[in-house]
């Protein structure tokens, strides 16, 4: 009976900061009672520790047992099907779930104008299931860097580009009126991490927001 | 930075096919993969199918398992979703969109940038 069932294809984590998500492909023509079971190793602690013995769905939020993620040497995953008593064998993820694996996002961004110019403030991930000790700012201390898109609306798709390395910072504008959409992009120079672009944010500049001058 | 185009849609006779294209043509993509979803006339958007975009694991609904297959190509950031033995009941928009989030595969909250939608009319 031990492993008749044919094991998930494949299993990864996709990570924000503190939101820890492990995700698997289903087996090929999965009954109605087959569930998975999910299980976790830290690294430096060699066994592997059982988290859910089945979960129906494709995913699992492994944030709450990940929390010491940003001090350690991370972990790996490993999920099998389960269908009564046959089990298959087990599918582990084939990278470490490390720091460097977490992608780089950005809170919200909030953006007003001042004498022609876009001031844009970019407020970091603040999650609620961060200790309180754990803020992004003090996890990744130096070296943070912003990506910057602007689009002009109307003329969809023509873009500029600038980076800057303040959770603050200002577009001049050249005089020119219209509606302003703003993404940003974080990174950390010193690491490796992927980032993520925001949600698009968007001003009106009008000629009331400009002084004039003799 | 993400801006997704959708092309491939028309109208097909059932048990034809179609190949729908899906290119982000924004500088770079940053999701985690990118996923289909579709509107019949008069109804919600649903899931159809979705792809991550590192491993090329893929998800399909149930109602189009089997018919439909979803690939990727990294070098052209682009997805394609290939549509065989098409039925009456897959006539609606199909929607491109990238997964922003880490949440699930098949819900439309872990998507956005959507794309503007290709037609895809299926006769009987």
């Known amino acids: 009976h031990g492993t008749e069932l044919p094991s998930p294809p494949s299993v990864w984590f996709e990570a924000e900061f503190f939101h820890h998500i492990l995700h698997w492909t289903p087996i090929p023509n999965q009954s109605e009672s087959t569930c998975y079971e999910v299980a976790l190793l830290r690294y430096g602690i060699e066994s592997w520790n059982s988290i859910s013995n089945c979960s129906q769905t494709l995913s699992y939020d492994l944030t709450a047992v990940t929390l010491d993620l940003y001090h350690s040497n991370g972990y790996r995953a490993r999920v099998r099907a389960v269908d009564g008593s046959r089990h298959s064998n087990w599918t582990v993820t084939n990278t470490r779930f490390s720091v460097d694996e977490v992608t780089l996002t950005v809170g919200s961004v909030n953006l007003e104008i001042h004498n022609g110019f876009i001031l844009g403030k970019i407020q970091l991930p603040r999650p609620k299931m961060a200790p309180a000790n754990d803020t992004y700012e003090s996890i990744f201390s130096h070296f943070r860097e912003y990506e910057i898109a602007i689009r002009k609306v109307p003329g969809n798709f023509t873009f500029t580009h600038k980076k800057v390395k303040h959770e603050n910072f200002s577009l001049l504008t050249s005089g020119e009126v219209g509606e302003f959409c703003v993404q940003v992009k974080p990174s950390v120079a010193s690491r490796s991490n992927k980032g993520m672009w925001s949600k698009e944010e968007c001003i009106s500049l009008t000629r009331q927001y400009f002084t004039v001058t003799n | 930075q993400v801006q997704l185009l959708e092309s491939g849609g028309g109208l097909v006779q059932a048990g034809g096919s179609l190949k729908l294209s899906c290119t982000n043509s924004?500088?770079?993509?940053?999701?985690?993969?990118m996923g289909w979803f579709r509107q019949p006339p008069g109804k919600e958007r649903e899931f159809v199918s979705s792809?991550?975009?590192?491993?090329?694991?893929?998800y399909y609904s149930d109602s189009v398992k089997g018919r439909f297959a979803l690939s990727r190509d990294k070098a052209k950031n682009t997805v394609y979703l290939q549509m065989d033995s098409l039925k009456p009941e897959d006539t609606a928009v199909y929607y491109c969109?990238?997964?922003?989030?880490?949440?699930?595969?098949?819900?439309?909250?872990?998507?956005?940038?959507w794309g503007q939608g290709t037609q895809v009319t299926v006769s009987s």
């Open positions: 924004g500088r770079t993509f940053s999701g985690y993969g």
């Open positions: 792809i991550n975009w590192i491993y090329g694991a893929t």
């Open positions: 969109a990238a997964k922003i989030n880490g949440e699930s595969y098949f819900n439309t909250g872990s998507f956005g940038s």
